[in-house]
């Protein structure tokens, strides 16, 4: 059996509004006073096992003590009333849990949604946290009939237990109640049909058109409450590799439909589509997006010819020469399909021409020393591109006109080239480049630029600290002009090694030092200057700076019969590198001099 408590705390279930004051009282039973020889002045109040300061406690009479708390902020406090029996033994009399919080705010932003195939779900903003157990009840009624209450589990939403009835207005509101108060939201009045969120369209399919390479036809199935609702659509698409969606103008898809033709697309390009729907009045909610579906536009003939160039090999005897025609595969955006082959036509005169069908990107032909015209077209299954035309002049013709003010410079991790055009109208420019090396041949890459371009960057994969030989050739209707070349670096570094110095001639008071240029593979940049450091075993180190065009230097004012240590360093814009140390000894006497 339970022992009777020695007294009670009132109120027994205290709930306090945060920030307010609160007073509790402890009343001791008469029998308890006599048993323990105590009165209310023996009471010790505790919160969470810590004694309450005396100034908060008031002894009302021999049986009753009160405690007052100001500005209550803790969410939950264990409050106990205890007595000191026999002077020092603390005995618990009674305990309560004191809760603090707020009365519920008036719920706001009440909205309801009817997910197709499910019951109505309403959501609201409960306002500030109450820190107390608060019941939220969704109420709904017709003008003449109440619906079952919906008890919210989470306090922010509730799904009603009944199926919605369409085309009849319903009134909905929320009641919030806790120990500190009760409040109702504003009510909302609506027809559930205007709150429908349809299921996403499905069976989205994409088909292309052989007639038009710029369109794709979409078809899909919409539900719309089993055909009860007319739905309008929202269509978005993107290319397969893009991350941002392109919007089909909503005004184009306003009328109820289950198919649509998307226009102005690029040929032979894979597009991804998605679609969603909403009641055609625009009331309610957009469905979730459908599953994505993709399709590829039909091929179109290539939109431009490939970049086209040639290289001439030395002539075999004098009767004919070998010419290597080279071109670049078209990017997908210009190929507009799978390139099947290339048609090359070489014409010597009106009566002499030869046609080749080539699957690769080069063709070597043998030509006499006459002038030829080469044309090149790319072909896919739809048709041929326009032709790129190159005039291959006779080797006896000297190329006139070249670009001027040719410059190259690195910027934004790219190697830029710029020039001033020649004074004669240009058809196009050819840029060629390769890595200069003493260990490997200069393997050229190249690119073509339009006649209007006079600044571009090299579009290959360039390496840092490699010396690039860059050549720019203007091409005219009559053939190539003169070529201009320069050297450039994408990014310089300090040289891989410094110069190896040696003595060319040593005199009593001077020495001629000589060195070889650092091989281009080790330069890692433009060698701007050299420094020569020299010292004796006991003397101070001397340093002289030498221009990079020199390969020898004379040290003067040297001491005779002295060992010198010399070292050279080479510097690029990015730093220097020392070569090995070299020693030499000056003679005691000059030549012909006697002691």
């Amino acid at each position: 059996q339970l022992l009777e408590p020695c007294g009670y705390i009132y109120p027994e279930f205290p709930v306090v509004q945060r920030g307010s004051n609160f007073t509790a009282i402890c009343v001791l039973k008469e029998a308890c006073l006599q048993h323990y020889y105590v009165n209310a002045s023996y009471i010790v109040w505790k919160t969470n096992h810590a004694a309450v300061p005396r100034e908060q406690v008031t002894v009302i009479n021999r049986t009753t003590s009160s405690v007052t708390f100001t500005d209550v902020v803790l969410p939950s406090v264990q409050l106990t009333c205890n007595i000191l029996s026999f002077g020092q033994i603390e005995q618990n009399v009674y305990g309560v849990t004191m809760l603090s919080g707020f009365p519920p705010d008036k719920p706001t932003n009440l909205t309801c949604i009817v997910n197709e195939g499910k019951n109505m779900l309403c959501q609201w903003d409960p306002g500030r946290e109450t820190y107390l157990e608060t019941n939220y009840t969704l109420k709904s009624e017709w003008a003449t009939e109440k619906f079952p209450d919906c008890q919210s589990k989470h306090g922010t939403s509730c799904m009603v237990s009944y199926m919605p009835t369409y085309y009849v207005n319903i009134e909905v509101w929320v009641e919030a109640e806790n120990a500190l108060g009760k409040v109702s939201s504003e009510s909302i009045n609506f027809d559930p049909v205007d709150k429908v969120k349809p299921t996403p369209p499905y069976n989205l399919s994409v088909t292309n058109s052989e007639e038009l390479s710029s369109i794709l036809k979409l078809s899909w199935v919409s539900s719309g409450l089993g055909g009860l609702l007319d739905l309008k659509s929202d269509i978005q698409y993107r290319t397969k590799d893009a991350s941002t969606w392109i919007q089909v103008p909503l005004e184009d898809t306003m009328s109820p439909r289950t198919s649509f033709t998307v226009q102005d697309l690029k040929p032979f390009t894979e597009y991804v589509f998605r679609i969603r729907s909403i009641k055609d009045s625009g009331k309610g909610y957009w469905s979730d997006w459908s599953e994505e579906a993709s399709g590829t536009t039909y091929e179109d003939r290539p939109s431009r010819p490939p970049s086209f160039w040639y290289k001439t090999n030395p002539s075999h005897g004098q009767e004919y020469r070998s010419v290597r025609l080279i071109w670049k595969a078209l990017p997908l955006s210009e190929a507009n399909g799978k390139i099947l082959d290339y048609e090359v036509i070489l014409t010597q005169s009106k009566s002499v021409s030869q046609t080749y069908t080539v699957t690769g990107t080069e063709l070597t032909v043998n030509l006499t020393n006459d002038r030829y015209v080469a044309s090149l077209a790319a072909r896919n299954k739809v048709g041929k591109s326009a032709a790129a035309v190159l005039t291959i002049p006779s080797p006896h013709v000297t190329a006139a006109y070249s670009v001027v003010n040719l410059k190259a410079f690195p910027k934004d991790n790219l190697l830029w080239v710029e020039w001033t055009p020649p004074p004669k109208p240009v058809s196009k420019y050819i840029l060629e480049w390769c890595v200069l090396s003493e260990n490997a041949p200069c393997v050229e890459d190249w690119q073509q630029e339009d006649a209007t371009v006079n600044r571009t960057h090299l579009r290959g994969r360039l390496l840092e600290s490699k010396c690039y030989q860059i050549t720019v050739t203007p091409v005219f209707a009559t053939g190539p002009g003169g070529s201009e070349s320069l050297k450039a670096y994408l990014k310089q570094a300090a040289p891989a090694r410094g110069p190896t110095v040696r003595t060319k001639k040593v005199g009593k008071n001077e020495a001629v030092l000589a060195w070889d240029q650092i091989p281009v593979d080790d330069q890692n940049g433009f060698i701007r200057n050299y420094s020569i450091s020299y010292r004796t075993s006991v003397g101070k180190e001397m340093v002289v700076h030498v221009d990079s065009s020199h390969t020898e230097y004379t040290l003067s004012s040297l001491s005779s019969d002295t060992l010198y240590m010399v070292r050279m360093a080479a510097y690029t814009d990015e730093g220097g590198k020392d070569g090995p140390e070299f020693t030499f000894t000056t003679p005691k006497f000059a030549q012909g001099e006697i002691e």
């Epitope: 005897g317 070489l346 030869q354 043998n366 030509l367 030829y372």
Partner: nanobody, 125 residues
Framework: QVQLQESGGGSVQAGGSLRLSCVIS????????MGWFRQVLGKEREGVAA????????VYADSVKGRFTISQDSSKNTVYLEMNGLKLEDTGMYYC??????????????????WGQGTQVTVSS
Amino acid sequence: QVQLQESGGGSVQAGGSLRLSCVISGFTYRPTFMGWFRQVLGKEREGVAAITTGGGSTVYADSVKGRFTISQDSSKNTVYLEMNGLKLEDTGMYYCAATTVITSVSINRNLYQYWGQGTQVTVSS
């Protein structure tokens, strides 16, 4: 690799006829034109006749005009030289040749890159 194989040579009486054949193989792109050349011991190789593989244009040495005819069968990759009214001076080694040089049909031997092994033609009285 490119190969040219001649056949059809032999001995014939003056005024007689022979038909030489040349089968070509190994070309990535067909030659621009093909020719027949002959060489008499101790003399330079001379052009006899040539034909374009595309349009069939022909050219002949003055010494054989009206007597020799060059023709081709593209489907068989074969070039023929029909020789009528053979003379003693037509005796020699006959070579088939091919070129990829793009120019007008010619019997300039310096324009030809590929040669056969030759077939002997002997005309006797």
